[in-house]
Interface confidence: low
C-alpha cells in the first residue's frame, strides 16, 4: 500500500549466506529473491537488520539445518531472534528448539520464528544458532525478514 | 483498516484439499474458515493464488504431513513456496525440510514458511511438496496465505 | 505507521506463562518483551487476546515443547489456535502436530502457527495444546500475538 | 448441495448399543474431518467425536471415551458412531456434522436422530 512520504513502506527479506567465522550470529545477503524496500531499513555487517523509524514491526527468521544426535551436543539446536537497541543490552525476542535427528548422517529440520516487537530508531535484529555448520544454505532454507505494521 | 477504494486490503487465506491428481503442487479450496478479502487477489484452479496489483506481500504456508522413514523415500519431506511472475520462470521463494520420522505408522510433523516478498501484477504464488499422499488435510493443519503491506 | 485516531494500530504479542491449572489452553502475560498496542486489543484471564474492532488480523503462535515418545500418550503433540466469536461455537483456525521425540529424558521441538482471519469485535482467540505440562517456557520460548492488517 | 442424513437411532436400555450411520452428499466427504455432536433434552450442544480424514486420528469427549467408536467408510461417503455400555446420561439427539472445529462449531449439520436409554 503506497503510504505517502510521511509514511513509507518499511520491509526487508534476506537470504542466509554460509560463513567462515565462527561466530554463532548467521550472516545474511541481499542476494536471490530479497527485499529491501528502502534506506529506513539496512542489512549491516552482513549480520543484522537495522531500522530507523520507531515503531512495531512483524520480525520473523527461518533456519533449516542438519544435525545428527550421535555426531552434535546433547544439547538441541537453538535458533534465537535477538534484539540489540541504543544504549542497551542484547535481548532475546524469540527462540525455538529442535533436538538433533537419529538420521545419517544428520537429518534436516526446520524451525520459524515469528513476532511483533516494538523497535527504537537504530534498534538492530539478528539471528543467533547454537551450531552455524549446521545450517543449510540451499535456495530458500534460511531467510530473516521483517515489515513494519 | 480501511485504506479506502484506491488502496484496499488484499489478503487471503486458503485451505488444503485432499487431491487424487499426482502433481507435487497442492492443492487449496475457500472452504472452512477461509479469507477472501476481494478480488485483488484470487484462487486459480485451486492451486496458485494470483495477484493484480504489484507491490510487497507478507506469504506464508503451513504443511503437516505424517511420513515414516522406512516407508519413504532417504530425502526429507521437503515444502517449497513459489513464484510465477508472467513472462518469466518459476522460482523457489522459501523452502523447509524435515527428515521422516521413526515413529510408526506414521510420524507427524509441521512446516510454516513465511517471508515478504515483491510482486507484480499477475504474479502467482504456490506450494509444492515431495509426496503430497503425506500431506494432513484435517482441520486448520495446512493453509496457505497472504497479506499485502 | 501512525494511522490517525481512525485508524490506530492493532497488535499484541504475549510471552507464555506456566500454570498449575490442568487446563489444556495455554496461558499467557504481558511480561518481558510483550507488546500491547492499545485497548483496542487485550489479554483476558491470561487465555485469550481480544479484539474490540472487526477486521482482517495476521495472528500467531509459536509454542516449543518437550517430549518423549514412550512417556506420552501415542497420540502427537498438537497445537490449535482457536477462534471464539460472540454468540458463536469455539471453531479451530490453525493446528500443528509433531510426534514426540526418542531423545531422552525429553526431546525439545517449536511449532510455528499462523494466519489471516477476518475476527468481529469482542472476538477471542487462544491456543490450545495436548499437554500443557511438556511445554517450554524459557525466554523466548513459547509466545502468542496478533497484528490487525 | 450439502447433505448429512442420520440414521440407526432408537430406544435402548442401559448397557445396551447402538450404531449410528450418516450418509453424507453433496460434497468431497474424502477431504473433511466429520464428527458427531449431542443435544440432550433442555441442554446445549455437546461435542461427541470427531474423526480425520483417512480415518486415522480419532477424537473423543471425555464423557463417551472407551464407550464409543467413531469411524468411517470413505467409499461409501459414509460415517459411523458405535456406541455401547449406554447410559442415561446418553440420551440425546446426535447430529452428524461437518467439518469439526475445535470441539464445537459446524458448517453443516444432519436433522439429527433420536437416541433414547431407558429401562
Known amino acids: 500500500m503506497q503510504k505517502g512520504d510521511q509514511n513509507p513502506q518499511i520491509a526487508a527479506h534476506v537470504i542466509s549466506e554460509a560463513s567462515s567465522k565462527t561466530t554463532s550470529v548467521l550472516q545474511w545477503a541481499e542476494k536471490g529473491y530479497y527485499t529491501m524496500s528502502n534506506n529506513l531499513v539496512t542489512l549491516e555487517n552482513g549480520k543484522q537488520l537495522t531500522v530507523k523509524r520507531q515503531g512495531l514491526y512483524y520480525i520473523y527468521a527461518q533456519v533449516t539445518f542438519c544435525s545428527n544426535r550421535e555426531a552434535s551436543s546433547q544439547a538441541p539446536f537453538i535458533a534465537s531472534l535477538c534484539l540489540k537497541s541504543p544504549g542497551r543490552f542484547e535481548r532475546i525476542l524469540l527462540r525455538a528448539a529442535n533436538t538433533h535427528s537419529s538420521a545419517k548422517p544428520c537429518g534436516q529440520q526446520s524451525i520459524h520464528l515469528g513476532g511483533v516487537f516494538e523497535l527504537q530508531p537504530g534498534a538492530s535484529v539478528f539471528v543467533n544458532v547454537t551450531d552455524p555448520s549446521q545450517v543449510s544454505h540451499g535456495t530458500g532454507f534460511t531467510s530473516f525478514g521483517l515489515l513494519k505494521l | 483498516m480501511q485504506k479506502g477504494d484506491q488502496n484496499p486490503q488484499i489478503a487471503a487465506h486458503v485451505i488444503s484439499e485432499a487431491s487424487s491428481k499426482t502433481t507435487s503442487v497442492l492443492q487449496w479450496a475457500e472452504k472452512g474458515y477461509y479469507t477472501m478479502s476481494n478480488n485483488l487477489v484470487t484462487l486459480e484452479n485451486g492451486k496458485q493464488l494470483t495477484v493484480k496489483r504489484q507491490g510487497l506481500y507478507y506469504i506464508y504456508a503451513q504443511v503437516t504431513f505424517c511420513s515414516n522413514r522406512e516407508a519413504s523415500s532417504q530425502a526429507p519431506f521437503i515444502a517449497s513456496l513459489c513464484l510465477k511472475s508472467p513472462g518469466r520462470f518459476e522460482r523457489i521463494l522459501l523452502r523447509a525440510a524435515n527428515t521422516h520420522s521413526s515413529a510408526k505408522p506414521c510420524g507427524q510433523q509441521s512446516i510454516h514458511l513465511g517471508g515478504v516478498f515483491e510482486l507484480q501484477p499477475g504474479a502467482s504464488v504456490f506450494v509444492n511438496v515431495t509426496d503430497p499422499s503425506q500431506v494432513s488435510h484435517g482441520t486448520g493443519f495446512t493453509s496457505f496465505g497472504l497479506l499485502k503491506l | 505507521m501512525q494511522k490517525g485516531d481512525q485508524n490506530p494500530q492493532i497488535a499484541a504479542h504475549v510471552i507464555s506463562e506456566a500454570s498449575s491449572k490442568t487446563t489444556s489452553v495455554l496461558q499467557w502475560a504481558e511480561k518481558g518483551y510483550y507488546t500491547m498496542s492499545n485497548n483496542l486489543v487485550t489479554l483476558e484471564n491470561g487465555k485469550q487476546l481480544t479484539v474490540k474492532r472487526q477486521g482482517l488480523y495476521y495472528i500467531y503462535a509459536q509454542v516449543t515443547f518437550c517430549s518423549n515418545r514412550e512417556a506420552s500418550s501415542q497420540a502427537p503433540f498438537i497445537a490449535s489456535l482457536c477462534l471464539k466469536s460472540p454468540g458463536r461455537f469455539e471453531r479451530i483456525l490453525l493446528r500443528a502436530a509433531n510426534t514426540h521425540s526418542s531423545a531422552k529424558p525429553c526431546g525439545q521441538q517449536s511449532i510455528h502457527l499462523g494466519g489471516v482471519f477476518e475476527l468481529q469485535p469482542g472476538a477471542s482467540v487462544f491456543v490450545n495444546v495436548t499437554d500443557p505440562s511438556q511445554v517450554s517456557h524459557g525466554t523466548g520460548f513459547t509466545s502468542f500475538g496478533l497484528l490487525k492488517l | 448441495e450439502v447433505q448429512l442424513l442420520e440414521s440407526g437411532g432408537g430406544l435402548v436400555q442401559p448397557g445396551g448399543s447402538l450404531r449410528l450411520s450418516c450418509a453424507a452428499s453433496?460434497?468431497?466427504?474424502?477431504?473433511?474431518?466429520m464428527g458427531w455432536v449431542r443435544q440432550a433434552p433442555g441442554k446445549g450442544l455437546e461435542w461427541v467425536s470427531s474423526?480425520?480424514?483417512?480415518?486415522?486420528?480419532?477424537y473423543y469427549a471425555d464423557s463417551v471415551k472407551g464407550r464409543f467408536t467413531i469411524s468411517r467408510d470413505n467409499s461409501k461417503n459414509t460415517l459411523y458412531l458405535q456406541m455401547n455400555s449406554l447410559r442415561a446420561e446418553d440420551t440425546a439427539v446426535y447430529y452428524c456434522?461437518?467439518?469439526?472445529?475445535?470441539?464445537?462449531?459446524?458448517?453443516?449439520w444432519g436433522q439429527g436422530t433420536l437416541v433414547t436409554v431407558s429401562s
Open positions: 456434522a461437518k467439518p469439526h472445529f475445535t470441539e464445537l462449531g459446524f458448517d453443516y
Open positions: 453433496g460434497f468431497t466427504f474424502t477431504s473433511y474431518e
Open positions: 474423526i480425520e480424514p483417512t480415518g486415522i486420528t480419532t
